[in-house]
Amino acid sequence: APVPPGEDSKDVAAPHRQPLTSSERIDKQIRYILDGISALRKETCNKSNMCESSKEALAENNLNLPKMAEKDGCFQSGFNEETCLVKIITGLLEFEVYLEYLQNRFESSEEQARAVQMSTKVLIQFLQKKAKNLDAITTPDPTTNASLLTKLQAQNQWLQDMTTHLILRSFKEFLQSSLRALRQM
């Protein structure tokens, strides 16, 4: 697995550099997770032909993956820093069960899948420190998550491949939208 942010060779080579600000740390953390997703997508795409499927075909699924909408305040029209931050944190918490599902889905990238999961937990902590309105953040119900995980793991091989692909693609899009919004804050 790649070295976590803050420990790469560039950082070692520049010991006198200013410490990262909270925003820079979050930015770097998200880019690190995106790199991990990219590596996982490579393995998924090499293994199955899911990546060639059109977005429309893949949209016909019963996964309730977090997605940014206009009302969430993360797009330029209707941009709202606090509403958006709540959506980002809530969405990441909702993705956690899907990241757990990914843990046994990779052969050569098992460590990478773990790194994405653990880095997301760290990212959530970073963002919670930034948020003023923590009360507005709803945490997913563990029992519901457990039954969802069981249901996903009971799918046939083709559906599991499809689910893996959809999770990675949706998580990537969610992180990209989140980071673009965070760069406005």
Partner: nanobody
Framework: QVQLVESGGGLVQAGGSLRLSCTAS????????MAWFRQAPGKEREFVTD???????WYADSVKGRFTISRDNAKNTVYLQMNSLRPEDTAVYYC?????????????????WGQGTQVTVSS
């Protein structure tokens, strides 16, 4: 990294329109966020607009409602449609790409840049 080449600049009268194009080669274009920046004589380079991998767009307040960014992934090209041009839009326009597909309003978010194309708006 991708190589970027801008085109479509020129001289236009105030109130007129221009469409800039930026064609990319050497990367998976559809996975990049693309942006336009501009630099007027004697000024810093400034953000104009960007479009993310999934199509979300952001605009600088000064161009909102007049400029439109779009992309054609099949042609590896991003466009900037500029309407109701003003003399203060005169600048060299640069295309930039972010390999993370995110974009942002600062130069540091982009890892590839074009050479720029001159846009002059006369009054």
């Amino acid at each position: 990294q991708v190589q970027l080449v801008e085109s479509g600049g020129g001289l236009v009268q105030a109130g007129g329109s221009l469409r800039l194009s930026c064609t990319a080669s050497g990367g998976t274009f559809g996975e990049y966020a693309m942006a336009w920046f501009r630099q007027a004589p004697g000024k810093e380079r400034e953000f104009v607009t960007d479009i993310g991998e999934s199509g979300g767009t952001w605009y600088a307040d000064s161009v909102k409602g007049r400029f439109t960014i779009s992309r054609d992934n099949a042609k590896n090209t991003v466009y900037l449609q500029m309407n109701s041009l003003r003399p203060e839009d005169t600048a060299v326009y640069y295309c930039a790409a972010d390999s993370y597909g995110v974009g942002g309003g600062a130069e540091r978010y982009y890892d590839s840049w074009g050479q720029g194309t001159q846009v002059t708006v006369s009054s």
